[in-house]
Interface confidence: medium
């Protein structure tokens, strides 16, 4: 049976940080399981991972390109991510994988979730000029 | 370095139970699945069950349902595998092992001879 | 349960010669989730444990010279040794890593000649 995961359609960060969850139809308790983020349409880059187990909570790391953090509980992984810019608006994908016991499980893909990274302006209040 | 060490030679009466020991060093012995092999000379290998000692949580084949009762200390860190009713054809060597990467039999014990004879 | 059949059951051979080694298997081990085969392969020298040598069906663990090689998917598997050494003389088991109960091939005993 494949895994199934919600995430937020849309997520619009005026900040920096943002965090992601993703909630799957399995219990996270189990033995040994990899959680990682993708970005981009065909998913070609692997954001930010973790490798869970039963018995210690997940040590997640990024790719070079961001800073990433994370967090599960039974069936939620948060993934965080800051120091994000207007290049890093994608769509990311939450991927899930039961590495052991037998049978392997992963989920299946999900709509993803659009990170929208507001451009920062910095706002000058104009005096109207004098005649 | 993963290192599983199992307990000596078992000579045993029919009908009676032994106690094997694998004790586990050089790695979190709670996170990890401990299997259970028996090797009969002049036969193949055959997997026995499995145990995690984060929970206790036990699989076994089910030819040894009844036969083994898996069992771990977190406080040794060691693995055991209990035989009851013992019979000749229980005679063989049983190996601890334990999972790595994407196999189920990564580290091995050196193994425990069990002689059932009357 | 799924059944491991391997092909022949003992092969006697020359130091140098190229060996094949089958395992066929009940069923599928290949996962459609990750793509891969879930076949382990081992080796057993007398008076001592199996060592993994192939898992993921071709996939060589480290320290395993490149003279063995895994090959295969789905229910077909094929261990070869491209130049058998003396120190090759072993049963070599395949083994079903795809879902509980783990099941294993009866083994094929290499003997020299």
């Known amino acids: 049976n494949k895994i199934l995961v919600k995430q937020s359609p849309l997520l619009v960060v005026d900040s920096n940080e943002v965090s992601l969850s993703c909630r799957y139809s399995y219990n996270l308790l189990a033995k040994e399981f990899r959680a990682s983020l993708y970005k981009g349409v065909n998913s070609d880059v692997e954001v930010c991972v973790g490798n869970g187990n039963f018995t210690y909570q997940p040590q997640f790391r990024s790719n070079a390109e961001f800073n990433c953090d994370g967090d599960f509980d039974n069936e939620t992984v948060t993934f965080r991510l800051w120091n994000l810019h207007v290049n890093h608006t994608d769509i990311y994908f939450c991927k899930i994988e039961f590495m052991y016991p037998p049978p392997y499980l992963d989920n299946e893909r999900s709509n993803g979730t659009i990170i929208h990274i507001k451009e920062k302006h910095l706002c000058h209040t104009q005096s109207s000029p004098k005649l | 370095q993963v290192q599983l060490q199992q307990s000596g030679a078992e000579l045993a009466r029919p009908g009676a139970s032994v106690k094997l020991s694998c004790k586990a060093s050089?790695?979190?012995?709670?996170?990890?699945?401990m299997q259970w092999i028996k090797k009969r000379p002049g036969q193949g290998l055959e997997w026995i069950g499995a145990?995690?000692?984060?929970?206790?949580?036990?699989r076994y084949t089910q030819k040894f349902k009844g036969k083994a009762t898996l069992t771990a200390d977190k406080s040794s860190t060691t693995a055991y595998m209990q035989l009851s009713s013992l019979a000749s054809e229980d005679s063989a060597v049983y190996f601890c092992?334990?999972?790595?990467?994407?196999?189920?039999?990564?580290?091995w014990g050196q193994g425990t001879l069990v002689t059932v004879s009357a | 349960d799924i059944v491991m059949t391997q092909s022949p059951s003992s092969l006697t051979v020359t130091a140098g010669e190229k060996v094949t080694l089958s395992c066929k298997s009940s069923q599928s081990l290949l996962n459609s989730g990750n793509q891969k085969n879930y076949l382990t392969w081992y080796q057993q020298k007398p008076g001592q444990p199996p060592q993994l040598l192939i898992y993921w069906a071709s996939t060589r663990e480290s320290g395993v010279p490149d003279r063995f090689t895994g090959s295969g998917s789905g229910t077909d598997f094929t261990l070869t040794i491209s130049s058998v050494q003396a120190e090759d003389l072993a049963v070599y088991y395949c083994q079903s890593d795809y879902s509980y109960p783990l099941t294993f091939g009866a083994g094929t005993k290499l003997e020299l000649k």
């Open positions: 050089g790695y979190t012995f709670t996170s990890y699945w």
């Open positions: 145990i995690y000692p984060g929970d206790g949580d036990t």
């Open positions: 092992a334990r999972n790595y990467r994407y196999s189920s039999f990564g580290y």
